[in-house]
């Protein structure tokens, strides 16, 4: 005759408060004759959870019809789960005896634990912007999950990062846990449009991880390059000088013109354009009056970007006698 096996397939069952838990138990033989009972815990203090023959178990129902002659499925459902229901559940076969049934074999047990989903990961970047080629730190936090086992990954534009440190607290037993991870990211000049992603995988999420994102645009400062040029064309007695401020981020920019060290207050024409990589270009035109009595003029384009120290470029204006005499356009 085949030896009876008590099969409880799940070692761990995660449930959420208020839901129904299904505890599986099947037997491999109908012999010996006798009932199958469910208990929580072991030892003299173990608690009877279900006995088909006697007792009142309002929250427990059976998955199969236990009165059927050849039934081998003794799985049960426990409704309205509360934190008090956690523990290890055993299905136990008893052999019919007199005056009392005698315990024959126990299943290996299924641990019922409260599963709690992690909160949506929150990613925080550095407090101040940093320039390319430097390293910045991002933190990712998620709270309230259980059990403690959790996986956290970092990505930059879809590429997995390896330079990060993760802690799960508390270290001991707890109702819920928190995870905090800090990733170190080297900024590239084109990172204005980049994203870092913190991805959290947990057993309660059924393979659908949670993600938190941060835009590197919040962390990066791309300083501008400046170029001041004198236009070859002239209109009447005015020369057009251009200051090109290229590839900067963020947009915050102050530009001032100085003529021989004196700040010019008059209006100048300018345009702002956005590059494909998210950086900006700013072009400012400055018209200088040319007259016979003028000495050489030194023009300065000064740019203050995102509250940083001002940078400037100078241009010594080249005005020839020919230019002074002629109204026609000429190349200096």
């Amino acid at each position: 005759e085949e030896e009876l096996q008590m099969i409880q397939p799940e070692k761990l069952l995660l449930v959420t408060v208020g839901k129904t838990a299904t505890l599986h138990c099947t037997v491999t033989s109908l012999l010996p004759v006798g009932p199958v009972l469910w208990f929580r815990g072991v030892g003299p203090g173990r608690e009877l959870i279900y006995n088909q023959k006697e007792g009142h178990f309002p929250r427990v129902t059976t998955v199969s019809d236990l009165t059927k002659r050849n039934n081998m499925d003794f799985s049960i459902r426990i409704s309205s789960i509360t934190p008090a229901d956690v523990g290890t559940y055993y299905c136990v076969k008893f052999r019919k005896g007199s005056p009392e049934n005698v315990e024959f074999k126990s299943g290996p047990g299924t641990e019922m634990a409260l599963g709690a989903k992690p909160s949506a990961p929150v990613v925080l970047g550095p407090a101040a912007r940093t320039t390319p080629e430097h390293t910045v730190s991002f933190t990712c936090e998620s709270h309230g999950f259980s059990p403690r086992d959790i996986t956290l990954k970092w990505f930059k534009n879809g590429n997995e990062l390896s330079d990060f440190q993760t802690n799960v607290d508390p270290t001991g037993q707890s109702v819920a846990y928190s995870i905090r991870s800090t990733a170190r990211v080297v900024l590239d000049p084109w990172d204005v449009r980049s994203q870092v992603i913190c991805e959290v995988a947990h057993v309660t999420l059924q393979g659908d991880p949670l993600r938190g994102t941060a835009n590197l645009s919040e962390a990066i400062r791309v300083p501008p390059t400046l170029e001041v040029t004198q236009q070859p064309m002239r209109v009447g007695n005015q020369v057009n000088v251009t200051c090109q401020v290229r590839k900067f981020y963020p947009q915050s920019l102050q530009l001032t013109w100085s003529e021989n060290g004196n700040v010019c207050q008059r209006e100048t024409a300018s345009t702002l354009t956005e590059n494909k990589d998210g950086t900006y270009n700013w072009t400012s035109w400055f018209l200088v009056n040319i007259s016979d009595q003028r000495d050489d003029v030194v023009l300065t384009c000064q740019v203050k970007h995102d509250g940083q120290l001002a940078v400037s470029k100078r241009l010594a204006l080249e005005v020839t006698v020919h230019q002074k005499d002629q109204s026609s356009d000429a190349t200096p």
Epitope: P44, R46, E47, L48
Partner: antibody, heavy 122, light 107 residues
Amino acid sequence: EVQLVQSGAEVVKPGASVKLSCKASGSTFTSYWMHWVKQAPGQGLEWIGAIYPVNSDTTYNQKFKGKATLTVDKSASTAYMELSSLRSEDTAVYYCTRSFYYSLDAAWFVYWGQGTLVTVSS
Amino acid sequence: DIQMTQSPSSLSASVGDRVTITCRASQDIGSRLNWLQQKPGKAPKRLIYATSSLDSGVPSRFSGSGSGTEFTLTISSLQPEDFATYYCLQYASSPFTFGGGTKVEIK
């Protein structure tokens, strides 16, 4: 009628061992956990541990681990407790009592043996 | 381990007196508490199980109440045969623990 009958009084020398017995009658021996309780002269009660005859599963009070060893003989419906390396502080009355195979409130410690006095003396 | 603190450790009373003994558990044990009576040279005898359920043959002058961590045994009218030592016992969690006992003596 359920009865738990314990072996007679023992006088033993320090360092020796002694094995006490508790024979159950009147119900299915294997359906119950057999517990052992110590009561030193003029003192209160202390739970030592328990054994489940079905599979000889044991549970001990940490304080008595290494001091007490619980065994059963199912065929004789008898539980045993061996006390080792005896010292004067082990002088006490030792009781057996029982509880049901799960924690049915009505079946905890309702039946008790009459007790066995163990005197440790040189 | 769960500690059971019983008070008083002894009391003197007269026949007909109302006697109250309390037991405090160091953590919640629900209602899993027994009250035992022990007379000199005899094995303990259970009077009450599950905090308030009277064992068969136990006089109705004995009653138990409480839950969680605070429990009380009351003898409504003390009789000569009630002079004994009383113990509370928790069976909620292993190791199972007893109170220190209350000796009820004749005044």
